[in-house]
Amino acid sequence: LVVTPPGPELVLNVSSTFVLTCSGSAPVVWERMSQEPPQEMAKAQDGTFSSVLTLTNLTGLDTGEYFCTHNDSRGLETDERKRLYIFVPDPTVGFLPNDAEELFIFLTEITEITIPCRVTDPQLVVTLHEKKGDVALPVPYDHQRGFSGIFEDRSYICKTTIGDREVDSDAYYVYRLQVSSINVSVNAVQTVVRQGENITLMCIVIGNEVVNFEWTYPRKESGRLVEPVTDFLLDMPYHIRSILHIPSAELEDSGTYTCNVTESVNDHQDEKAINITVVESGYVRLLGEVGTLQFAELHRSRTLQVVFEAYPPPTVLWFKDNRTLGDSSAGEIALSTRNVSETRYVSELTLVRVKVAEAGHYTMRAFHEDAEVQLSFQLQINVPVRVLELSESHPDSGEQTVRCRGRGMPQPNIIWSACRDLKRCPRELPPTLLGNSSEEESQLETNVTYWEEEQEFEVVSTLRLQHVDRPLSVRCTLRNAVGQDTQEVIVVPHSLPFK
């Protein structure tokens, strides 16, 4: 295709006449604004086709694009279409008129767009402004196309000065529809309700402006529809929430509630479900086993924990020996009940630096108007063993006795042992265990007493040695669940002058 004059940009005088010619090897045609203006088409003897477009009495409204294309324009190649842009500076025409479709620009993503305000004179300075502001925006301008850039959701106008007259364009409206992949979250005020109470569920979508919510729920399947309410969360942009509210729930309302959200612009969708349980009346249920005998170690802190589930939230009380417990001001007892999930609770009794007097019968009671549960256990305070006395004596009978006395809780075990080779035992040789064996020349007698007030056992054990022929190291070891203690004494033969 050959166009004369070649352009690609021409500036023509207003009221003048101008001739555009296009020729090619196949039939050609001039197009203006997707239409074919009146033109003269011809075919030369050499087979060349041409079209002549005569523009008469030019005005500013003739400003714009002109295309020459092959008349049979199937499968257009780039060389089969020539573009020419003509300016006709005309002080009587401010901005060229736009189709209505050009004034309203809709986007679903952040992308460059053009605000197509065009003037008839390429020498004019054109500025872009928000409709409600005077400041010119720093956006590049192309006299043939307009302002191109990434625009916010606003209304814009273009301004230029023709002579001493300021001219405004029509307003251009840019709308961005906020669309993203859908991520739905569903939650309920309560997932467990008693019959007669309300069920309220919320379905929230973030990052989209136009979505459609559809709920499915047990009542819907039986044809009893509930109208959800949709609102926009003020403090969070593009947060849309649908609320499904079912007053006075029935047992049949138990089941799965699903919120399905669709967005038609990009055809995204997501759904989330939540289970709701409607109970006839409230309940309190213990979870897990708590042994009827619990232990705490003297002067250590001990936390006793009970896990249960309940609805509605219960009152929790602790008792010791049938007397109500409360947080002590001295900080010796701490009570707490935590809600670890909607219907699950953990109640804890913490005894700080346990004292012997804190042994006893404990009960936790959890209750509300519909149900109650209680759990009891005995608390035993364990006391590490202490050897209180280890003494040796020589009765007239000629035998030698060693007495060991100690205390602890639970009841201590006593172990007697001896080292006959003082040089090598106990480092190289193990001590010999002593007891009531017939082979050994020793006898053992042990008495155990329980002291109610101190709540601990006392063990008194006497070891009788028949004859001691050389010095002997005798060791008394007391052992219980929380510790052990040892003392030793040297027993010498009667025949030796020293003891």
Partner: nanobody, 116 residues
Framework: QVQLVQSGGALVQPGGSLRLSCAAS????????MSWVRQAPGKRLEWVSA????????YYAGSVKGRFTISSDNSKNTVFLQMNSLRAEDTAVYYC?????????WGQGTLVTVSS
């Protein structure tokens, strides 16, 4: 809180009429242009019509000019789209949209189905 609540979508036969409403709250219509936009199944968003805040100037896409009429009732803060001589190609989800402060706001959409 700016909110646009739409109503009026329905199934209608070709040649029939329908009137869509868009009730605005949280801002005054007389200060803002309001647009109607539609999206046919599997197609891109298409601008349909608009009205300026005063109600004095109306705009139409070529595809609906002469068949659709946009109007507003500023006392009720509501914009209407009267759709006559409906065709199968008018089947779409219709949205109303406006500017408010520093962003645009959209109605929830309403489905118009033109089918015999």
């Amino acid at each position: 809180q700016v909110q646009l609540v739409q109503s009026g979508g329905a199934l209608v036969q070709p040649g029939g009429s329908l009137r869509l409403s868009c009730a605005a709250s949280g801002f005054t219509l007389s200060n803002n242009a309001m647009s109607w936009v539609r999206q046919a199944p599997g197609k891109r968003l298409e601008w349909v019509s608009a009205i300026d805040g005063s109600g004095g100037t109306t705009y139409y896409a070529g595809s609906v000019k002469g068949r659709f009429t946009i109007s507003s009732d500023n006392s009720k803060n509501t914009v209407f789209l009267q759709m006559n001589s409906l065709r199968a190609e008018d089947t779409a989800v219709y949205y109303c949209a406006t500017h408010g402060g520093d962003r645009s706001y959209w109605g929830q959409g309403t489905l118009v189905t033109v089918s015999s």
